[in-house]
Interface confidence: low
């Protein structure tokens, strides 16, 4: 057959559908490969040919659309599932093309079970909602186009294994969770389950998304340098190792980045002809404040290191602020019969 | 395996209050309703009571004005006082879970407890 | 007074099929959903169907449920004299805003 671009299997879009539930997959040809849409390519005389091979084969096959039901069909650019069934699990590709022209790309399609409490291998997107922050809400994902506008469809909210009613500071109102007031003990999967009919048909979609209640930014703070400070002086005699810690406090904030850094005579460690290591831990609360620490470490401290000036400094969104560690060589302890008869006054 | 156990006093006196306390073990008392349920001597199940972990409560109308839940998260405990107790309370008590779909998949054993001076 | 209604017994030989309804009103079954509950002599109530004619796992597919309009039924087929005991329709009411159980059925198996 004549050369076709082949855009590969795109693994970045991992679709994941609940077995017995409808799906409408779009061709991602239209979405992240070509640079226009499928109006303008159907106008253009283009066809979309849709193919699959199952778990497990190596063999490409027609997809059956004459289906009971019309259980799989597809709809300008969008392959639908009503609804899946577990076996349905494999690569799809999508291929448009003409006498001249061709272009396909493959995206896998896994089919998952749920059990009655709504635990499943599907991968959670995470919505995070601030603490004690005042009414706020989540959305239930990824219903648009599966019913008309003039469809009123059910919706009933769980969280974990429990349906959503009277709880006291979580309400449901239609596709829509509103949390009056987020505590910790929100934190937890929550679901929506939509029903709605068609062609005398009753369909139900299920979407489970992460609550993460984290750090208001009513209460965020410039970083904290909790270490080096003021009450700790690192004092070291040459050939010892010189270990200071750096342990910064950052209050969550929303795509803010965390950074710690060391400078030793205002350069970079990098820029300096000393053997300096630094390890860094993290650590987060469970309202994903975070706590980095970074020790910097001279194995074998030399006079001269001991004289230069050792920065901390950390950034986020809300501010940047730097500490300076107190460095000192050790006075060695005097020997008695030099030092101490001198000054004695002996002769 | 999640288990529910009933614990109390398995006499009260009229006039006096109920109290009962039922422990989950293997499992937490997050993401459910925990409810109360009875059985009165030689009658039908009575639905008593719900609360969630976070203190919200819903009560059977016709006992509202005598019950009290409570829930104690660290100890994976929720608890029930019935109070102004008369002779038509005595009854086996069971403590249950409800999980998905509004129905009781996992109840405690019971416990009978007598109204009687 | 129950707001299920319930027969208050039922019969059956071993081998037969057996089916007991559970008669309510559209505030409780019929915006709802029922579960059957299976009472034993001294043992803790088992929940035998959810949202109608669900069976948990370890329930033997010999009970069905099922729902039409405001009643439901639970039909119990290939009847084992272990099946004696008491069941119990349940639902959630709108109107109570609280859960309602039925009177009960005890199943003598003859």
């Known amino acids: 057959s004549e050369r076709c671009d082949d855009w590969g299997l795109d693994t970045m879009r991992q679709i994941q559908v609940f077995e017995d539930e409808p799906a409408r997959i779009k061709c991602p040809l239209f979405e992240h490969f070509l640079k226009f849409n499928y109006s303008t390519a159907h106008s253009a005389g283009l066809t979309l040919i849709w193919y699959w091979t199952r778990q497990d084969r190596d063999l490409e096959e027609p997809i059956n659309f004459r289906l009971p039901e019309n259980r799989i069909s597809k709809e300008k650019d969008v392959l639908w599932f009503r609804p899946t069934l577990l076996n349905d699990t494999g690569n799809y590709t999508c291929m448009l093309r003409n006498t001249t022209y061709c272009s396909k790309v493959a995206f896998p399609l896994e089919v998952v079970q749920k059990d009655s409490c709504f635990n499943s291998p599907m991968k959670l997107p995470v919505h995070k909602l601030y603490i004690e922050y005042g009414i706020q809400r989540i959305t239930c994902p990824n219903v648009d186009g599966y019913f008309p506008s003039s469809v009123k469809p059910t919706i009933t909210w769980y969280m974990g294994c429990y349906k959503i009613q009277n709880f006291n500071n979580v309400i449901p109102e239609g596709m829509n969770l509103s949390f009056l007031i987020a505590f910790i003990s929100n934190n937890g999967n929550y679901t929506c389950v939509v029903t709605y009919p068609e062609n005398g048909r009753t369909f139900h979609l299920t979407r489970t998304l992460t609550v993460k209640v984290v750090g208001s930014p009513k209460n965020a703070v410039p970083p904290v340098i909790h270490s080096p400070n003021d009450h700790v002086v690192y004092e070291k005699e040459p050939g010892e190792e010189l270990l200071i810690p750096c342990t910064v406090y950052f209050s969550f904030l929303m795509d803010s980045r965390n950074e710690v850094w060391w400078t030793i005579d205002g350069k970079k460690p990098d820029d300096i002809p000393i053997d300096v290591t630094i390890n860094e831990s993290i650590s987060h609360s469970r309202t994903e404040d975070e706590t980095r620490t970074q020790i910097l470490s001279i194995k074998k401290v030399t006079s001269e290191d001991l004289k230069r000036s050792y920065v901390c400094h950390a950034r986020s969104a809300k501010g940047e602020v730097a500490k300076a560690a107190t460095v000192k060589q050790k006075v060695p302890a005097p020997r008695y019969t030099v030092e101490l008869a001198c000054g004695f006054g002996a002769t | 395996q999640v288990q529910l156990q009933e614990s109390g006093p398995g006499l009260v006196k009229p006039s006096e209050t109920l109290s009962l306390t039922c422990t989950v073990s293997?499992?937490?008392?997050?993401?459910?309703?925990w409810n109360w349920i009875r059985q009165p001597p030689v009658k039908g199940l009575e639905w008593i009571g719900y609360?969630?972990?976070?203190?919200?409560?819903n009560y059977n109308p016709s006992l509202k004005s005598r019950v009290t839940m409570s829930v104690d998260t660290s100890k994976n405990q929720f608890s029930l006082k019935l109070s102004s107790v008369t002779a038509a309370d005595t009854a086996v008590y069971y403590c249950?879970?409800?999980?998905?779909?509004?129905?009781?998949?996992?109840w405690g054993q019971g416990t009978l407890v007598t109204v009687s001076s | 007074q129950s707001v299920l209604t319930q027969p208050p017994s039922a019969s059956g030989t071993p081998g037969q099929r057996v089916t007991i309804s559970c008669s309510g009103s559209?505030?409780?079954?019929?915006?709802?959903?029922v579960n059957w509950y299976q009472l034993l002599p001294g043992t803790a109530p088992k929940l035998l169907i959810y949202?109608?004619?669900q069976r948990p796992s370890g329930v033997p597919d010999r009970f069905s449920g099922s729902k039409s309009g405001t009643s439901a039924s639970l039909a119990i087929s290939g009847l084992q004299s272990e099946d004696e005991a008491d069941y119990y329709c349940?639902?959630?009411?709108?109107?109570?805003?609280?859960?309602?159980f039925g009177g009960g059925t005890k199943l003598t198996v003859l």
């Open positions: 249950a879970r409800e999980g998905l779909h509004d129905a009781f998949d996992i």
């Open positions: 293997g499992g937490s008392v997050f993401s459910y309703f």
């Open positions: 609360i969630d972990h976070s203190g919200g409560t």
């Open positions: 559209s505030s409780n079954i019929g915006s709802n959903t």
């Open positions: 949202s109608n004619y």
């Open positions: 349940a639902a959630w009411d709108d109107s109570l805003n609280g859960r309602v």
